[in-house]
């Protein structure tokens, strides 16, 4: 029986700069029941606080709700692991909410085959930004990426869409079912997960772009 091993805070993410969650990996348990607590202070302050919510983010997590989240302050946090034989502390982690934003994926991905009479047909897709992100405030610039592939292909074809929420693709294989996904990222932050795949059957008479 030993004191617990050193835990590690390995990830902090915010969906929208208004709340955030951090997760830690336990060290070895020393063969005894181990309790974990996350404590933090804001840079420039000495007053220590304990994690306000160990539940919302799931096991080994700390969630900071709106009232505990400040955008313009750096958080200094560490995790303490304790059992009957002693304690161990993680390294301190410095967190600035501005740089840990990982939005939810975009919504309402719509994919259509357009066949104008006077031009080559194309695949047109549009989507909406995630609901938790308020783009009107100007705090966010969201960038988008789309990927698509024939159903049985192993490789995705990826396109950067910039800030636009629609995109056209001209080169497609007629008669194939295509999978399409979209994701987004803020200018300082992480890519979202890919949205669920939307699928569309390309007509057999779809004319390939020259």
């Amino acid at each position: 029986q030993l004191p617990p091993g050193k835990p590690e805070i390995f990830k902090c993410r915010s969906p929208n700069k208004e709340t955030f969650t951090c997760w830690w990996r336990p060290g070895t348990d020393g063969g005894l029941p181990t309790n974990y607590s996350l404590t933090y202070h804001r840079e420039g302050e000495t007053l220590m606080h304990e994690c306000p919510d160990y539940i919302t983010g799931g096991p080994n997590s700390c969630h900071f709700g709106k009232q505990y989240t400040s955008m313009w302050r750096t958080y200094v946090m560490m995790v303490n692991a304790t059992n009957q034989m002693g304690s161990s502390f993680s390294d301190e982690l410095y967190v600035d909410v501005t740089y840990i934003v990982q939005p939810d994926p975009p919504l309402e991905l719509t994919v259509e085959v357009k066949q104008p009479e006077d031009r080559k047909p194309y695949l047109w897709m549009k989507w909406s930004p995630p609901t938790l992100i308020d783009l009107k405030t100007g705090w966010f610039t969201l960038l988008y990426e789309i990927r698509l592939k024939p159903e049985k292909a192993a490789e995705w074809e990826t396109h950067f869409a910039g800030q636009q929420t629609e995109f056209k693709i001209l080169s497609l294989h007629p008669g194939q079912k295509y999978l399409v996904q979209v994701r987004c990222k803020p200018d300082h932050g992480y890519w979202s997960a890919w949205s669920p795949a939307t699928f569309i059957q390309i007509p057999s008479d779809f004319i390939m772009n020259d």
Epitope: P105, E108, A153, S195, A197, T198
Partner: antibody, heavy 114, light 107 residues
């Protein structure tokens, strides 16, 4: 012809774990993201999560957070779903489903009973 | 999460008649909606995706309509093999969710 063939029925005690396999044929697993769906006896369908073998990313329903692990072995074209800390409410038929929903495994009955 | 509500829970229809099943989403899912048929002891079978596109091998008597939050599955002339459970499911965002199902039974 694409087929998803799942492992056989399991009986587990409360608190134990179960690992269900899903062997893909007629397709490579690399090309096929896999959803896991379950159905308790006499109840409706419940989406559990998605595993994308291409990038190893997993997404799961909040209620399974910390209990479900979805993995895949591209060398054998087999996807796996492990559910831990089993309770009686986890008694269900578990299905693996291809990304476009038109390919379903035959289902694996997991019974949790002391 | 998006809540999918199906109505009615049970629909009694005579063979040869039309059946209309409804599915409502608690927020817009665009056209990212699928319909399934399930018979006792079997895995579900995909009928429609994209709200209105028939899956491979699905007869023309099955049709779907709607977008946003209101969707309908119509079976134009019920055959004996169509008496089953029907589920809708959105794939607009994570988590995917299913409706509670509609049982179509013989009147």
């Amino acid at each position: 012809q694409v087929q998803l063939v799942q492992s056989g029925a399991e009986v587990q005690k409360p608190g134990a774990s179960v690992k269900v396999s899903c062997k893909v044929s007629g397709y490579t697993l690399t090309a096929l993201s896999i959803h896991w769906v379950r159905q308790a006896p006499g109840k409706g369908l419940e989406w559990m999560g998605n595993f994308d073998p291409g990038d190893g990313e997993t997404i799961h329903a909040q209620k399974f957070q910390g209990r479900v692990t979805m993995t895949g072995d591209t060398s054998t074209d087999t996807a796996y779903m492990e559910l831990s800390s089993l309770r009686s409410e986890d008694t269900a038929v578990y299905y693996c489903v291809g990304v476009t929903f038109d390919y379903w495994g035959q289902g694996t009955l997991v019974t949790v009973s002391s | 999460e998006i809540v999918m509500t199906q109505s009615p829970a049970t629909l009694s229809v005579s063979p040869g008649e039309r059946a209309t099943l409804s599915c409502r989403a608690s927020q817009s899912v665009a056209s990212n909606l699928a319909w399934y048929q399930q018979k006792p002891g079997q895995a579900p079978r995909l009928l429609l995706y994209g709200a209105s596109t028939r899956a491979t091998g699905i007869p023309a008597r099955f049709s779907g309509s709607g977008s946003g939050t209101e969707f309908t599955l119509t079976i134009s002339s019920l055959q004996s093999e169509d008496f089953a459970l029907y589920y809708c499911q959105h794939y607009n965002n994570w988590p995917l969710t299913f409706g509670g199902g509609t049982k179509v039974e013989i009147k």
